[in-house]
C-alpha cells in the first residue's frame, strides 16, 4: 500500500506517457488520476513500467472500480493483466472475444496461469457454451485446453465447434474426454465422404465404440498403428482378425511390434490362434484350436 501524499508541484500527470517511468510509487499514486488512467489504458502497455509501478496503477484502478473493471479497461490491460488475481478476474464480465484474445496474448508462451484459467472460465460461462470461435481462439493459445476440461464441461461443446479442433489439441485427452467428444465429432463430420471423414475423425477415435470401428473397417481407411493403439480396449476386443486386417490395411504388420501392449495384447488373447496365423505375423497367445469361447457378457445380458 502506498502512503497518501500530495503531488509535488509540476508533477501532476496530464496524460499517460513515458515520463511516468521516472515517478516513484508514491508519485504515481499522488499524481496520476485514476480516471485518466482508465481512459488511457491502451498507452500503459507501450510504457516500460516496473512491476512495482504496475502495482500502483492496479491499485488506482481497484479504487476506481471496486466492483470490477469495465470491459473497456479490461481490453487494454496488457501486461497489467499479469498483476490481476483470480479474485479480481471473478468480478469481471468479459463478453468480447477481442478482449479475451488481447489478454491471452499477454500470457502467450507461458503455462496457463490461474488468472488465465479464471478468465476463460468467466468468458465461457458468460457465453453459455464453448462456441467454435472461442474454441478456435483458446486452442490456438493453449493446444491442451480442450483436454483440461472435465467430461461435464466438454458436454457443453456444440458439435459445430469440433471443426476448430486440431489433432494436437487432443494429445493429452483421456478416454473419458474422448468418449464425450467422439459423438460430437461424428455428428459434425457426418456429411463428409469416406476418406475425408476418416482424416477428420481419426484423432477422436479414442472414444469410438466397436460398431463404428467395424463400419470403418469396411471403408479401406488404412488406420495407422498410433491411432489403433489409442482405441478403447473394450471397443477393440470384439473385432475379428479380418476386421482388424481391413481396418489397418498395410499397417497390420505393425501389430507384431505392439503384441505385448494394450489393446493389441488383450485383443490377441480373445482371437483364435488359427485366425491370427492367417495374418502371417507370428502373433502368439491366441485361443488354441478346439477350445470353446464363451462370451459371458452376452450370457449375462440374456439372463
Amino acid at each position: 500500500e502506498v502512503e497518501k501524499t500530495a503531488c509535488p508541484s509540476g508533477k501532476k500527470a496530464r496524460e499517460i506517457d513515458e515520463s511516468l517511468i521516472f515517478y516513484k510509487k508514491w508519485e504515481l499514486e499522488a499524481c496520476v488520476d485514476a480516471a485518466l488512467l482508465a481512459t488511457q489504458m491502451d498507452r500503459v502497455n507501450a510504457i516500460p513500467f516496473t512491476y512495482e509501478q504496475l502495482d500502483v496503477l492496479k491499485h488506482k484502478l481497484d479504487e476506481l472500480y471496486p466492483q470490477g473493471y469495465p470491459e473497456s479497461v479490461i481490453q487494454h490491460l496488457g501486461y497489467l493483466f499479469l498483476k490481476m488475481s483470480p479474485e479480481d478476474i471473478r468480478k469481471w464480465n468479459v463478453t468480447s472475444l477481442e478482449t479475451l484474445k488481447a489478454l491471452l496474448e499477454v500470457n502467450k508462451g507461458h503455462e496457463m496461469s490461474p488468472q488465465v484459467a479464471t478468465l476463460i472460465d468467466r468468458f465461457v460461462k458468460g457465453r453459455g457454451q464453448l462456441d467454435k470461435d472461442t474454441l478456435d481462439t483458446l486452442t490456438a493459445f493453449y493446444p491442451g485446453y480442450l483436454c483440461s476440461l472435465s467430461p461435464e464441461e466438454l458436454s457443453s461443446v456444440p458439435p459445430s465447434s469440433i471443426w476448430a479442433v486440431r489433432p494436437q489439441d487432443l494429445d493429452t485427452c483421456d478416454p473419458r474426454q474422448l468418449d464425450v467428444l467422439y459423438p460430437k465429432a461424428r455428428l459434425a463430420f457426418q456429411n463428409m465422404n469416406g476418406s475425408e471423414y476418416f482424416v477428420k475423425i481419426q484423432s477422436f477415435l479414442g472414444g469410438a465404440p466397436t460398431e463404428d470401428l467395424k463400419a470403418l473397417s469396411q471403408q479401406n481407411v488404412s488406420m495407422d498403428l498410433a491411432t489403433f493403439m489409442k482405441l478403447r480396449t473394450d471397443a477393440v476386443l470384439p473385432l475379428t482378425v479380418a476386421e482388424v486386417q481391413k481396418l489397418l490395411g498395410p499397417h497390420v504388420e505393425g501389430l507384431k511390434a505392439e503384441e505385448r501392449h494394450r489393446p493389441v495384447r488383450d485383443w490377441i488373447l480373445r482371437q483364435r490362434q488359427d485366425d491370427l496365423d492367417t495374418l502371417g505375423l507370428g502373433l502368439q497367445g491366441g485361443i488354441p484350436n478346439g477350445y470353446l469361447v464363451l462370451d459371458l457378457s452376452m450370457q449375462e445380458a440374456l439372463s
Epitope: E3, E18, S19, I21, F22, K24, W26, T50, E52
Partner: antibody, heavy 121, light 107 residues
Framework: QVQLQESGPGLVKPSETLSLTCTVS??????????WGWIRQPPGKCLEWIGN???????NYNPSLKSRVTISVDTSKNQFSLKLSSVTAADTAVYYC?????????????WGQGTMVTVSS | DIVMTQSPSSLSASVGDRVTITCRAS??????LAWYQQKPGKVPKLLIY???TLQSGVPSRFSGSGSGTDFTLTISSLQPEDFATYYC?????????FGCGTKVEIK
C-alpha cells in the same frame, strides 16, 4: 562487469556548449533494468544530480539545469551523452556518468571515473 | 527541492572507533536514502540504499538506519581504508539531492 567511461574536452569556453559522452562496457545500455545518469561535483562543493535517461530516449532533468541540458542515448554505440549549453565558470566541475538500477528506492551503483571540465576563456 | 544536511561536516577518529554520521532531510523522504563513500581523487562508491540495505560487497561494519527525515550511517569499527568523505542522497523525488559530505579523518 559493467564499466562506465566518460570522454570529452576538458576545457570549454564560456557561453559555449559542454559535450560529454559516457561509454558503457560489459553490459547493454538497452537493459530495461537501468536508468543512466549524469552527476557533477564542482571543486570542493557538493555533488549535484544533472539528469537521467532510459535507453528508449526518455529523460528526466534537474529543473535548475533543464533549460540548458540535453541527455541523449545511442544504443548502437552503447553510449549516452550530455550537452550543457551556455556554460559559465560555475559549470566547472568533475562530471560523472553513473548507472541507476530501476527500483523504487534506487541509488547510483556504478560510476564512471569522472572527467574534469574547466570553463575558461 | 529537498535539502539534505549532513553533520558533522568533518570528524577525527581512530582505527577501531565506532563512528556515526547523520543526515537530515528538509522534508519526509520515507526510507529513500543512499549513502556513498568517496576517497580523494576517486569515484563515489555506493554503500547503502533504501536507508538500511547494504550494497553487495560492502563490509558489514557499515550500517544505515532511519526513516522520515533523520538518518544515520554507522561504522562499527573504523578501519584504515574507511578514512574518506561520506555523502547521503535522497531518491524520494527528483531532483535527486546530495548532502555536502562528512569527512572522516585520522585522529
Amino acid at each position: 562487469q559493467v564499466q562506465l567511461q566518460e570522454s570529452g574536452p576538458g576545457l570549454v569556453k564560456p557561453s559555449e556548449t559542454l559535450s560529454l559522452t559516457c561509454t558503457v562496457s560489459g553490459g547493454s545500455i538497452s537493459s530495461s533494468s537501468y536508468f543512466w545518469g549524469w552527476i557533477r561535483q564542482p571543486p570542493g562543493k557538493c555533488l549535484e544530480w544533472i539528469g537521467n535517461i532510459y535507453y528508449s530516449g526518455s529523460s528526466n532533468y534537474n529543473p535548475s539545469l533543464k533549460s540548458r541540458v540535453t541527455i541523449s542515448v545511442d544504443t548502437s554505440k552503447n553510449q549516452f551523452s550530455l550537452k550543457l549549453s551556455s556554460v559559465t565558470a560555475a559549470d566547472t566541475a568533475v562530471y560523472y556518468c553513473a548507472r541507476l538500477p530501476r527500483g523504487d528506492r534506487d541509488a547510483f551503483d556504478i560510476w564512471g571515473q569522472g572527467t574534469m571540465v574547466t570553463v575558461s576563456s | 527541492d529537498i535539502v539534505m544536511t549532513q553533520s558533522p561536516s568533518s570528524l577525527s577518529a581512530s582505527v577501531g572507533d565506532r563512528v556515526t554520521i547523520t543526515c537530515r532531510a528538509s522534508q519526509g523522504i520515507s526510507n529513500y536514502l543512499a549513502w556513498y563513500q568517496q576517497k580523494p581523487g576517486k569515484v563515489p562508491k555506493l554503500l547503502i540504499y533504501a536507508a538500511s540495505t547494504l550494497q553487495s560487497g560492502v563490509p558489514s561494519r557499515f550500517s544505515g538506519s532511519g526513516s522520515g527525515t533523520d538518518f544515520t550511517l554507522t561504522i562499527s569499527s573504523l578501519q584504515p581504508e574507511d578514512f574518506a568523505t561520506y555523502y547521503c542522497q535522497q531518491s524520494y523525488s527528483t531532483p535527486f539531492t546530495f548532502g555536502c559530505g562528512t569527512k572522516v579523518e585520522i585522529k
